[in-house]
């Protein structure tokens, strides 16, 4: 059975939008006006994952691209990357764990915790134009809270 997905954009809690920075990286920066069209549109898929009270397992693909955010170890550190997949096989209900994020939503603020690396979150820097990354701290300098905007399919 096909997995259910919704198209959306994400902005961090400082209202920075996410845009492509090269073929396999996202960066966060403030956009306005027509520049808003640069922001990436995600296809958020609702996938299978471990049972948890307040966490919803999702995968975050780039709309109409065969790229998914994934979490892997690089130099022994959990790292966020954009990974290319075979579009014939993705998205699917049972995504590999590296593609799965636990969406935690409180008062319309979203966090995305790596299922592969608990307590590591999709993060942005306070600074402008910096890469989106996987961060191991919450509530510090780096930003782990996002808002979501629906996009028409």
């Amino acid at each position: 059975a096909p997995v259910r997905s919704l198209n959306c954009t994400l902005r961090d809690s400082q209202q920075k939008s996410l845009v492509m920075s090269g073929p396999y990286e996202l960066k966060a920066l403030h956009l306005q006006g027509q520049d808003m069209e640069q922001q990436v549109v995600f296809s958020m898929s609702f996938v299978q994952g471990e049972e948890s009270n307040d966490k919803i397992p999702v995968a975050l693909g780039l709309k109409e691209k065969n790229l998914y955010l994934s979490c892997v170890l690089k130099d022994d550190k959990p790292t966020l990357q954009l990974e290319s997949v075979d579009p014939k096989n993705y998205p699917k209900k049972k995504m590999e764990k590296r593609f799965v994020f636990n969406k935690i939503e409180i008062n319309n603020k979203l966090e995305f915790e790596s299922a592969q690396f608990p307590n590591w979150y999709i993060s942005t820097s306070q600074a402008e134009n910096m890469p989106v990354f996987l961060g191991g701290t919450k509530g510090g300098q780096d930003i782990t809270d996002f808002t979501m905007q629906f996009v028409s399919s």
Epitope: A1, N7, E51, N108, F150
Partner: antibody, heavy 120, light 107 residues
Framework: QVQLVQSGAEVKKPGSSVKVSCKAS????????IEWVRQAPGQGLEWMGE????????NYNEKFKGRVTITADKSTSTAYMELSSLRSEDTAVYYC?????????????WGQGTLVTVSS | DIQMTQSPSSLSASVGDRVTITCKFS??????LSWFQQKPGKAPKSLIY???RLVDGVPSRFSGSGSGTDFTLTISSLQPEDFATYYC?????????FGGGTKVEIK
Amino acid sequence: QVQLVQSGAEVKKPGSSVKVSCKASGYTFDRYWIEWVRQAPGQGLEWMGEILPGSGDINYNEKFKGRVTITADKSTSTAYMELSSLRSEDTAVYYCARMYYDYDQGFDLWGQGTLVTVSS
Amino acid sequence: DIQMTQSPSSLSASVGDRVTITCKFSQDIDRFLSWFQQKPGKAPKSLIYRVKRLVDGVPSRFSGSGSGTDFTLTISSLQPEDFATYYCVQYDEFPYGFGGGTKVEIK
């Protein structure tokens, strides 16, 4: 107060159409699917389709495809279900219900129901 | 479409009895299962979502369990206000489907 309020009962002739409304209040209309479910007299529940007002995504039960149209008006927080080519078997109570966009909480709030009677 | 069977279709029980209702599916429906209560002439009322999570305000005598294809609603000690019809629903795959219902009657 969080609620879904549906339009009143309708009596329709076979072959005609009916449009049932479902007005939401007390929550963010955009972020919840509005589900449409019907229940024929003395029968069980049957899912007809859904709409997510925030994105415009719509999913229909194939059984009703071509006969049912689901829409939403974000400005009034109202969803609509129109059923055409009515026949006597469409006599039922039609319910709207809501479900969060991520499907987490199931059909957690229901309208009071709208009785549609199809009779010549 | 996912095939489903809810059983029993009806049962007679007394106040204080433990009541169990089951829903079986033709394929894995992950966590997307809810249970409802419906009284005559009224809209359904949600009791349990995501298999086992109790809706706010629903008494703790109601509980849900199961995984994969087999799911259960249990009422640990039936109360007078629990005499009603109960339905399961899967919302894992289109078309979403409701069980045929279980009418709980007074013995």
